[in-house]
């Protein structure tokens, strides 16, 4: 998995008038890292992990960059011609990556009312847009504004390709991101489903990195994919992830089923609790 830094900026307009506030979220290696969600931006680390990465310093630099980018995006939204009455949003997502072989990738994507209409490869400076006429109109609108206003909106390009990578390298230097392996806590619960059946759910939480194998086995053999329901692997707000897998089994056969978990080279199996009690499995030994 490459290391990545992802900026997600959102600005809003109401009845054609651009609102003063904006929302900025920054993800480091897919984890919520920084956030600005007030009228007046103040970069806030998302959890202890983010604070550890940033170290003992103020986040003035991050605040300055995010505020500047928010202002630029508001100016861009103001130049979108076809704004109808009501609420509209313009979103810019910028991503840079450093791969294992040290190669880099950077891209920028614009969304209007949640719909992608313009993308740019920040290395090749190549623009792409969806085929729909609405997207093409919006794309031309925004591209023209960015070209015309390139001098005025220097800050718009400030945290792009080079600076995004510079920031990412700076964060990685802390070592916190590179070193981190946090094993999951796994717990198995049961609930009545229908007559003679129970649903067993296996939850893994608090793990990092996000790659995990979680599956149900009967007598040691994996159940087929279509007999299991998987939850997405989602950030849990603490710089770690959570997920779950569930399946339906016959009541009385609980002892035959185990939840198998594999993460960062470690593995464990977790039985179904015999009663309706929640059984907590600790970290692996």
């Amino acid at each position: 998995e490459p290391h990545s830094l992802r900026y997600n900026l959102t600005v809003l307009s109401w009845d054609g008038s651009v609102q003063s506030g904006f929302l900025t979220e920054v993800h480091l290696d897919g984890q919520p890292f920084l956030r600005c969600d007030r009228q007046k931006c103040r970069a806030k680390p998302q959890g202890q992990w983010a604070e550890d990465v940033l170290g003992n310093k103020t986040w003035d630099r991050e605040t300055r960059d995010l505020t500047g980018n928010g202002k630029d995006l508001r100016m861009t939204l103001a130049h979108i011609k076809d704004q109808k009455e009501g609420l509209h949003s313009l979103q810019e997502i910028r991503v840079c990556e450093i791969h294992e072989d040290n190669s880099t990738r950077s891209s920028q994507h614009f969304y209007y009312d949640g719909e992608l209409f313009l993308s740019q490869n920040l290395e090749t400076k190549e623009w792409t847009m969806p085929q729909s006429s609405r997207a093409q109109t919006l794309a031309m609108n925004v591209r023209n504004f960015l070209k015309e206003d390139a001098m005025k909106t220097k800050t718009h390009y400030h945290a792009m390709h080079a600076d995004c990578l510079q920031e990412l390298r700076r964060y990685l230097k802390s070592g916190v991101v590179l070193r981190r392996t946090v094993p999951p806590m796994v717990n198995v619960t049961r609930s009545e489903a229908s007559e003679g059946n129970i649903t067993v759910t296996c939850r893994a939480s608090g793990f990092y990195p996000w790659n995990i194998t979680l599956s149900w086995r009967q007598d040691g053999v994996s159940l087929s994919h279509d007999t299991q329901q998987w939850g997405d692997v989602l950030p849990d707000g603490n710089g770690t992830y959570q997920t779950w897998v569930a399946t339906r089994i016959c009541q009385g056969e609980e002892q035959r089923f185990t939840c198998y978990m594999e993460h960062s080279g470690n593995h464990s199996t977790h039985p179904v609790p015999s009663g309706k009690v929640l059984v907590l499995q600790s970290h692996w030994q």
Epitope: Q218, D219, G220, V221, S222, S224, D226, T227, C250
Partner: antibody
Framework: EVQLVESGGGLVQSGGSLRLSCVAS????????MNWVRQAPGKGLEWISY????????YYADSVKGRFTISRDNAKKSLYLQMNSLRDEDTAVYYC???????????????WGQGTTVTVSS | DIQMTQSPSSLSASVGDRVTITCRAS??????LNWYQQKPGKAPKLLIY???SLQSGVPSRFSGSGSGTDFTLTISSLQPEDFATYYC????????FGGGTKVDIK
């Protein structure tokens, strides 16, 4: 006594079909996952198919996928293997085998039948 | 698919010898590994499950070890009835057997 007895083997032309049966006794078949395993003359064991107790998980070895179908009828205490488009290389002794239900099991086969011989000739 | 490689494919030993058979998986299979014994004209018999657990009724001279990709079946003191072919089998990803190890009299 816990026992598995296979039947249905015999001589069949290449491209032909055959249905093997395996009857269980001494235990409740419906509670167990079952398998078919074969052994070509002078060769090693080859797992070919698995079906779990609820028949909602079925696996096949690549060598038989699309040609063989595993099924079970718990009321008749029987496991089946429908073999179509038979080839010379399907010639083997076919065993049915039960997956152990012991706690901590890892898909081990604790009860085996005596085997039934299938010969495919071209 | 996971490949299971047994070595040696055959070995000659005497009664009382300590015999070791190895099984290597093409990728990590945790402890999802079982061992069987088969005598000519007979069905296989389960010896060890979960890499190291002895199946009920199997003599304690048989033992298994290993985890991940490398596994070992050991017969501490070979008895006359132990001359047979031994197979490993994995259930980590569907199911596959190793090629077998034939143990015959030296």
């Amino acid at each position: 006594e816990v026992q598995l007895v296979e039947s249905g083997g015999g001589l069949v032309q290449s491209g032909g079909s055959l249905r093997l049966s395996c009857v269980a006794s001494g235990f409740t078949l419906s509670s167990y996952s079952m398998n078919w395993v074969r052994q070509a003359p002078g060769k090693g064991l080859e797992w070919i198919s698995y079906i779990n107790s609820r028949s909602n998980t079925i696996y096949y070895a690549d060598s038989v996928k699309g040609r063989f179908t595993i099924s079970r009828d718990n009321a008749k205490k029987s496991l089946y293997l429908q073999m179509n488009s038979l080839r010379d290389e399907d010639t083997a002794v076919y065993y049915c085998a039960r997956v152990s239900s012991i706690t901590g099991n890892t898909g081990a086969f604790d009860v085996w039948g005596q085997g039934t011989t299938v010969t495919v000739s071209s | 698919d996971i490949q299971m490689t047994q070595s040696p494919s055959s070995l000659s030993a005497s009664v009382g010898d300590r015999v070791t058979i190895t099984c290597r998986a093409s990728q990590s299979i945790s402890s999802y590994l079982n061992w069987y014994q088969q005598k000519p004209g007979k069905a296989p018999k389960l010896l060890i499950y979960a890499a190291s657990s002895l199946q009920s009724g199997v003599p304690s001279r048989f033992s298994g070890s290993g985890s991940g990709t490398d596994f070992t079946l050991t017969i501490s003191s070979l008895q006359p009835e132990d001359f047979a072919t031994y197979y490993c089998q994995q259930s980590y990803s569907t199911l596959t057997f190793g090629g077998g190890t034939k143990v015959d009299i030296k």
